[in-house]
Interface confidence: low
């Protein structure tokens, strides 16, 4: 059968039919349904939601919907022995204690099983000592403290404000600095937007609100006890001492009311500059310890959380492809939440649900996609991307041979200003073309395309007339597919105006106040931004699964490779003397990029001209496109990060959320001037240039004519 016969409707009509079937009212209804009680990973409530979604996806018309379960390490507070932080006087008496829970939002006062704020996977402990304020606890903050201010964090409890970087990196940095405990808090400077009221009267964080979250440094490992392999019934589990990524010091999060009580007494050094000051009426002194009057008082942490092997459940739905059933396009997002999940994840899960419903409607009318579409509702994302990673580990052989693309679907909104897209360069043209076909939901852009409003509000820093598309980092379920397996990946959501809102993420992130009402009252009352995100995510999946030639443009990879090579070269050129001394050359990398550019250009010409009615040639060309992302995978992985195997992109070693280009070279160059053995350090730079150049050249050759 030709592809058009198989899919039964003309391709243009298919896409329009699919998009027209998506309804804002349904997304709203699904969001309400998913947010009435907490769905914490490993709980009965989340298992019940998994079964509900399985049942509804079957009703919607998918060919099969299965639960895939794993037994992974999770972390919970002790219900009878709560976590808190005290100020103690010289007699050891607790003269101040932090709150044990967040005041519940209106209408939720009688909801049970709201997990109190905690840092997942914190070890137990009751350290006491002087406090040191470490700003955001970034690498550069500790450099400032230790190198410039000569402040030693060894044996101290550090207090860090949330924001800028992933919390796990903060904890790792504190550990490396010798701290014996970490207090994380939300400063109003980062989580309280000026001119907006606190929840429930607005979308700002109240003083008693607290951000939950895991503090692991997994580096893509998945379940800490079974790195590289699925946590199935016959798994061999590591002992807790050998588990991957667990923190070694107690950690606990607090809100800004409680933070004020700790910070207002701080003495010692003044903050080094204004970038260390938040918005509380406290001096932001660095410490160590409290001021004169309070100098005998100490801070004591009381952490009693436990790590437990617990069963989690993914829901995997299949819509079999009519022509290429062995080619998989995956749409996945998580289901587990810290509490109600009003934004994270259920604003995403509701969109996935509506996308499944629309695809199911088309299928019931006799249509099938060209390629197989897999839909996933992941569990335990909040505990370290565990559900997606375990499933990918279990199915890695299939995925690396058959995986065309992965589209992520966590939170659909983090604001209501404009679109935000992070994806592989292979998808740039797909995203551009799709957004030109969609209507903008933005006020002032009636009748204009989404591409137009997006480009106006978020212009590309390099190319005029084009929108910004960012690198993929991590901190979400695409990680295993992209960074480990090399499957082309992308994500899209509506975001805030980064120019005017300098706070980190959205204020109520991972708090009890992330409710349905937050979304319905303040972010998207008409659910028009949710609908737009559904159209973008669903449209990408539709095109990836249905277009005859895969909608990947390898020339866009060539463009960014040159940009990344220029960037890393300029970083290295900050050390011209050492480059000369150790004969460091980037010639091989620039040569490989040039070759890639030429070969990609020739491949694109052949792609225009080949006989698309010849199924063998069509499959061959599509396979070259599908396997291009795979060609950037180094089977040995990055140094000390074996599950980050993509040579062009990896999560930053200093911030899991951010993507870094040529990460092997970047990390080898980072802080190289402080290395004790410069010869060895520059040798590693040269090795990383070699690995990168080889990989780019090898990837280029996969696009060459096959014989």
């Amino acid at each position: 059968k030709s592809s058009n016969e198989a899919t039964n409707i003309t391709p243009k009509h298919n896409m329009k039919a699919f998009l027209d079937e998506l309804k804002a009212e349904n997304i709203k209804k699904f969001l309400y349904n998913f947010t009435q009680i907490p769905h914490l990973a490993g709980t009965e409530q989340n298992f019940q939601l998994a079964k509900q979604i399985q049942s509804q996806w079957k009703e919607f018309g998918l060919d099969s919907v299965e639960l895939a379960h794993y037994d992974v390490l999770l972390s919970y507070p002790n219900k009878t022995h709560p976590n808190y932080i005290s100020i103690i006087n010289e007699d050891g008496n607790e003269i101040f204690n932090t709150s044990l829970f967040e005041p519940p939002p209106p209408g939720y006062e009688n909801v049970s099983d709201i997990v109190p704020p905690f840092s997942a996977f914190s070890p137990q402990g009751m350290p006491e000592g002087d406090l040191v304020y470490v700003n955001y606890a970034r690498t550069e903050d500790f450099f400032k403290l230790e190198r410039d201010m000569k402040i030693n964090c060894s044996g101290k409890i550090v207090i860090a404000r949330y924001g800028k970087v992933f919390r796990g990196n903060k904890v790792k940095n504190a550990q490396l600095a010798g701290a014996k405990g970490v207090i994380l808090y939300s400063d109003p400077a980062d989580y309280f937007a000026p001119g907006v009221k606190s929840y429930p009267d607005g979308w700002n964080l109240p003083g008693g609100g607290v951000q939950r979250g895991n503090i692991l440094n997994l580096n893509g490992a998945g379940d800490p006890l079974t790195p590289g392999y699925p946590a199935n019934e016959y798994a061999y589990r590591r002992g807790i001492a050998e588990a991957v990524g667990l923190p070694s010091i107690p950690v606990h999060p607090i809100g800004y009311y409680d933070a004020q009580k700790l910070l207002e007494k701080m003495g010692g050094s003044a903050p080094p500059d204004s970038s260390w000051r938040g918005s509380l009426k406290v001096p932001y002194n660095v410490g160590p310890g409290f001021t004169g009057n309070f100098s005998t008082q100490k801070v004591k942490m009381h952490i009693h959380s436990t790590n437990e092997v617990t069963r989690i459940y993914n829901v995997i739905g299949t819509l079999r492809g009519a022509v290429e059933p062995d080619r998989y396009v995956i749409l996945g997002g998580h289901r587990d939440s810290w509490v109600f999940g009003g934004i994270d994840p259920q604003s995403g899960a509701a969109v996935v649900h509506e996308i499944v419903r629309s695809f199911g409607t088309l299928k019931k009318e006799g249509w099938r996609p060209r390629r197989t579409i897999l839909f996933a509702s992941w569990d335990a994302e909040e505990f370290g991307l565990l559900g997606s990673t375990e499933w990918a580990e279990e199915n890695s052989r299939l995925l690396q041979e058959r995986g065309v693309a992965y589209i992520n679907a966590d939170s659909s909104i983090e604001g209501n200003y404009t679109l935000r897209v992070d994806c592989t360069p292979l998808m740039y043209s797909l995203v551009h073309n799709l957004t030109k076909e969609l209507k903008s939901p933005d006020e002032g852009f009636e009748g204009k395309s989404l591409y137009e409003s997006w480009t106006k509000k978020s212009p590309s820093p390099e190319f005029s007339g084009m929108p910004r598309i960012s690198k993929l980092g991590s901190g979400n379920d695409f990680e295993v597919f992209f960074q480990r397996l090399g499957i082309a990946s992308g994500r899209a959501r509506y975001t805030k105006n980064w120019e005017t809102n300098k706070f980190s993420g959205y204020p109520l992130y991972h708090s009890v106040y992330e409710t349905y009402e937050l979304v319905e009252k303040f972010y998207d009352p008409m659910f028009k931004y949710h609908l737009t995100v559904a159209q973008v995510r669903g449209g990408m999946v539709f095109e990836l699964a249905n277009s005859i030639v895969l909608p990947f443009d390898c020339r866009d990879y060539a463009v960014v490779l040159r940009k990344y090579a220029d960037k890393i070269y300029s970083i290295s050129m900050k050390h011209p003397q050492e480059m000369k001394t150790y004969s460091v050359s980037f010639d091989s990398l620039f040569s490989a990029v040039k070759n890639f550019t030429e070969i990609a250009s020739k491949f694109s010409e052949r792609l225009q001209d080949f006989d698309k009615s010849n199924p063998i040639v069509l499959r061959m060309m599509n396979d070259q496109l599908m396997f291009l992302e795979r060609a950037f995978i180094d089977p040995l992985g990055l140094p000390d990060r074996p599950f980050y195997r993509h040579v062009i992109y990896a999560p930053s070693s200093h911030n899991k959320y951010a993507g870094e280009s040529f990460p092997g070279i970047y990390d080898a160059l980072f802080d190289i001037e402080s290395k004790v053995d410069p010869s060895k350090a520059w040798g590693e730079v040269k090795r990383q240039i070699y690995v990168a150049a080889f990989t780019v050249q090898a990837a280029a050759e996969t696009l060459s004519e096959v014989a």
Epitope: Y84, S99, P103, F192, P200, G208, Q260, K261, L280
Partner: nanobody, 126 residues
């Protein structure tokens, strides 16, 4: 809005006890701290005691320390002040106050922007 209604005041002999109650109604969500402030005839308002919503932090003024205890029943949205060993100088109108304390304020400071009850008279006299 939040409504606060005090009860339990009265005339009592020195050395005896009284228990004041303050029932909160209306939009009580977001109330972070509740407390008692008193005003004796011809004098300024004086802070007596305060408690955070979680009950984890309480503060009692030095003038009543060891004699007065503040507590709160969240399920009933009620604040209590147990006053033992009463003295003549405890005679005053006792006001219940509640605050959703914006950041940057000392937690037990009550001011005009907070919620106040009408007050209940306590007279200690032989």
């Amino acid at each position: 809005q939040v409504q606060l209604v005090e009860s339990g005041g009265g005339v009592v002999q020195p050395g005896r006890s009284l228990r004041l109650s303050c029932a909160a109604s209306g939009r009580t969500f977001g109330i972070y701290v509740m407390g008692w402030v008193r005003q004796a005839p011809g004098k300024e308002r004086e802070f007596v005691a305060a408690i955070e919503w979680s009950g984890s932090n309480r503060l009692v003024s030095d003038s009543v320390k060891g004699r007065f205890t503040i507590s709160r029943d969240n399920s009933k949205n009620t604040l209590y002040l147990q006053m033992n060993s009463l003295r003549a100088e405890d005679t005053a109108v006792y006001y219940c106050a509640a605050s959703n304390r914006l950041y940057g304020r000392t937690w037990y400071d009550f001011n005009e922007s907070d919620y106040w009850g009408q007050g209940t008279q306590v007279t200690v006299s032989s």
